[in-house]
Interface confidence: low
């Protein structure tokens, strides 16, 4: 009913709550002397469904049969219309359309932890659209029954607030849920279980790890569990991995030895528990324990390479380079590298520990046979030393690889190819491809890169430390016993025309010809490997085409003679540089007049 209904009544039959698809009769009747003021037959009763007029009748009452009402609540209002006045609201009613509850399905109960309380969940089935009450009943041994009601509109969970104890773990309990509304009731199938079936242990806590004698091979994981736990499963993985290692253990009593951990690796560990081999469910995973395993002595050997540089008649500079061990080989933080330099015939040796670098330079006599050994040390020990005999890597001309080429291969890669040396190719034990940024003046501080290639390979893709628009000096070494041969080439991964031309810094006259000297183009403006320089000249005030002389690029060259200038004529000279992509803009212009006599 709505409003006070002082003027009349609205009745609904058979009920205000009906099953979907049912028909209802709605009657609106006026109370005595509540009609229109003058003439009661002028009474016009109108029935509204929400705001839409669905029926009307002149007189003291109105009957209406209504079908097809939708699920949910529908509001009907009866109004009186008299001549020359507004409609007056008489009374109204709400009709609730719904369905009887379906049988609740998949009833399941759980108790979280031995000290937890029993809670059950179920699937309600389709919405009844009516107020529906759920009653959960749990019956156990000794005729004990617990009951709890839920009046929430969407009820599919109830916590009994009681704790099942393990005194008789095999005792049966039965749970049942019943749904009731105005249109009917329905009960779930009973769910029967024991203590062991429904208790889900709390996840293990207080997880710790111990490494006996700081060794990764003697590692024990400890944790605490609820008292009745019989089974555990452990999962662990390196922190940077997505894949877990899994171990199942029985009667672990809060400890387990792990035998396959890698040294110097941060691991994540989690543990789950269960009360019975085949009853009940696993606990949630414990909170993660993160721990780093101890170091072990390095395995593997360093990849070592070297460069020799002539200083004077009696001395040479040796620069040693080596690559870091991989994480799995280093097995700890590398504290230092140990370099031993030995003269093989005289037996003199010197050892040095190097920290923070992967290179070492020293000066040794040019005489004698020298060897080096390099190893990496962490807190637990050293790797096996890599031994190298220092030799003239390019001395054996017959071992020099042939037809070396270097071509751009995609973004920041260079493909180096070669042909085996003329001398018996089967004598080659390995090739080494070495590359470094080309710096005029042969700067020895420029980082050196190298890779090793098997003797049957005739190509290598170099990509490490390769930058676009930089020229690299690439050498291919063929090594055979204590001999080596090499060939070199310049290469770049990407090139374009140089950004500027060489800067002419001097023009000098020598015996009727001139010598032009220039400064190298800064490396960052070369935009790849230079192929040629061009020297242009023309008479100062002439409109004729300039003459030019093209000279191949050589790293160390920065002067060139020209002998075709006429005496006592003023010339303008300038230079450009070329890569495979094109020619630079002009460098600076210089004027010059040859003073010598005409031939």
């Amino acid at each position: 009913k709505i409003d006070a209904c002082k003027r009349g009544d609205v009745t609904v039959k058979p009920s205000h709550v009906i099953l979907l698809g049912s028909t209802v009769n709605i009657t609106c009747s006026l109370k005595p002397r509540q009609g229109c003021f003058h003439y009661s037959r002028r009474n016009k009763l109108i029935l509204y469904k929400f705001d839409r007029r669905i029926n009307f009748h002149h007189g003291h009452s109105l009957n209406s049969q209504v079908t097809g009402l939708p699920l949910g609540t529908t509001l009907f209002v009866c109004k009186l219309a008299c001549i020359n006045s507004d409609e007056i609201q008489i009374c109204g009613a709400e009709i609730f359309v719904g369905v009887a509850p379906e049988q609740p399905q998949n009833l399941s109960c759980i108790q979280k932890g031995e000290q937890g309380t029993v809670a059950c969940t179920w699937e309600r089935g389709r919405d009844t659209h009516l107020y529906t009450e759920y009653t959960l009943q749990l019956s156990g041994p000794k005729n004990l029954t617990w009951q709890k009601q839920c009046k929430d509109i969407y009820c599919d969970y109830l916590d009994f607030g009681i704790n099942l104890t393990p005194e008789s773990p095999e005792s049966n309990f039965t749970a049942k849920v019943t749904a009731v509304n105005s249109l009917g009731s329905s009960s779930s199938l009973p769910s029967t279980f024991t203590f062991l079936d429904i208790v889900r242990p709390l996840p293990p806590w207080d997880i710790r790890i111990k490494f006996q004698k700081a060794s990764v091979s003697r590692c024990t994981l400890y944790w605490r569990d609820e008292g009745l736990v019989l089974l555990n499963r452990l999962r662990y993985r390196p922190s940077n991995s997505r894949l877990w290692n899994m171990v199942n253990v029985t009667k672990a009593k809060g400890r387990h030895d792990l035998l396959d951990l890698k040294p110097f690796t941060e691991y994540e560990f989690q543990i789950s528990s269960k009360l019975h081999l085949y009853k009940g469910s696993w606990s949630d995973w414990s909170e993660s324990l993160r721990a780093q395993t101890p170091e072990e002595e390095p395995t593997g050997m360093l990849d070592v390479w070297y460069m020799k540089r002539h200083i004077d008649y009696s001395r040479q500079q040796i620069s040693l380079f080596w690559k870091n061990l991989s994480v799995s080989e280093a097995r700890g933080k590398i504290l230092h590298y140990q370099v031993t330099l030995q003269e093989l015939t005289g037996g003199k040796a010197m050892t040095q520990n190097i920290t923070g670098h992967t290179s070492w330079t020293t000066v040794i006599p040019r005489t004698g046979n020298w060897a080096v050994a390099v190893s990496a040390a962490n807190s637990k020990g050293s790797s096996l030393p890599t031994r190298i005999n220092i030799m003239n890597l390019c001395e054996a001309g017959l071992l020099a690889p042939r037809q070396v080429s270097a071509n751009s291969e995609g973004m920041d890669n260079i493909l180096v190819t070669w042909q085996p040396p003329r001398k018996d190719p089967s004598a080659v034990q390995e090739y080494v491809v070495e590359w470094r940024e080309l710096h005029p003046g042969g700067d020895t501080q420029v980082p050196l890169n190298w890779l090793r290639s098997r003797p049957y390979n005739v190509s290598a893709l170099i990509s490490e430390n390769i930058k676009s628009y930089i020229c690299y000096e690439i050498r291919v070494y063929a090594l055979s016993g204590d001999q080596g041969g090499c060939s070199s080439i310049l290469g770049n991964s990407k090139h374009k025309a140089p950004l500027s031309g060489p800067h002419i810094n001097a023009i000098t006259e020598e015996k009727g010809s001139i010598l032009i000297s220039w400064n190298s183009i800064p490396v960052q403006e070369q935009m790849g490997c230079l192929l040629h320089y061009r020297i242009y000249w023309k008479e100062r005030d002439s409109n004729s085409q300039p003459q030019l002389c093209e000279i191949p690029y050589r790293v160390s060259q920065n002067s060139h003679p020209i002998n075709s200038l006429q005496p006592r004529v003023t010339y303008v000279l300038w230079m450009t540089a070329l890569t495979a992509a094109g020619e630079s803009s002009h460098g600076n212009e210089r004027e010059f007049c040859l003073q010598g006599k005409a031939n």
Partner: nanobody, 129 residues
């Protein structure tokens, strides 16, 4: 840029209560670890309470405050709170809010200052009669 702003500190008598707030702006931290630290004069900054940031937000507490302090957050408002009850004189300190840009599910890591990428300026809590 990211900013964390603490508020709610003040002078309170022993046994009293306070609710500290930390409002984050500049990015959303709803899925990431956040924590409260405190620093008394002449001591190191110490961990008080933290939220893991993983699904379901595990709460971590230092033993000295367990049961008296409650950490919570409202992801929609990008705000974190620390409810402090039964205050003691030894709770006197500057309280700092900290936020990480990752989930932290290890008790060892949640306590480390280095775990957190952003810090607030702090709010003073003084407990005195």
């Amino acid at each position: 840029q990211v900013q964390l702003q603490e508020s709610g500190g003040g002078l309170v008598q022993p046994g009293g209560s306070l609710r500290l707030s930390c409002a984050a702006s500049g990015r959303t931290f709803s899925n990431y670890a956040m924590a409260w630290f405190r620093q008394a004069p002449g001591t190191e900054r110490e961990f008080v309470a933290g939220l893991s940031g993983s699904g379901g937000d595990t709460a971590f507490y230092d033993n000295s405050v367990m049961g008296r302090f409650t950490i919570s957050r409202d992801s929609a408002k990008n705000t974190m709170w620390l409810q402090i009850n039964n205050l003691k004189p030894e709770d006197t300190a500057v309280y700092y809010c900290a936020a990480a840009t990752h989930v932290v599910v290890s008790y060892g890591l949640v306590r480390r200052r280095g775990t957190y990428d952003y810090w607030g300026q702090g709010t003073q809590v003084t407990v005195s009669s």
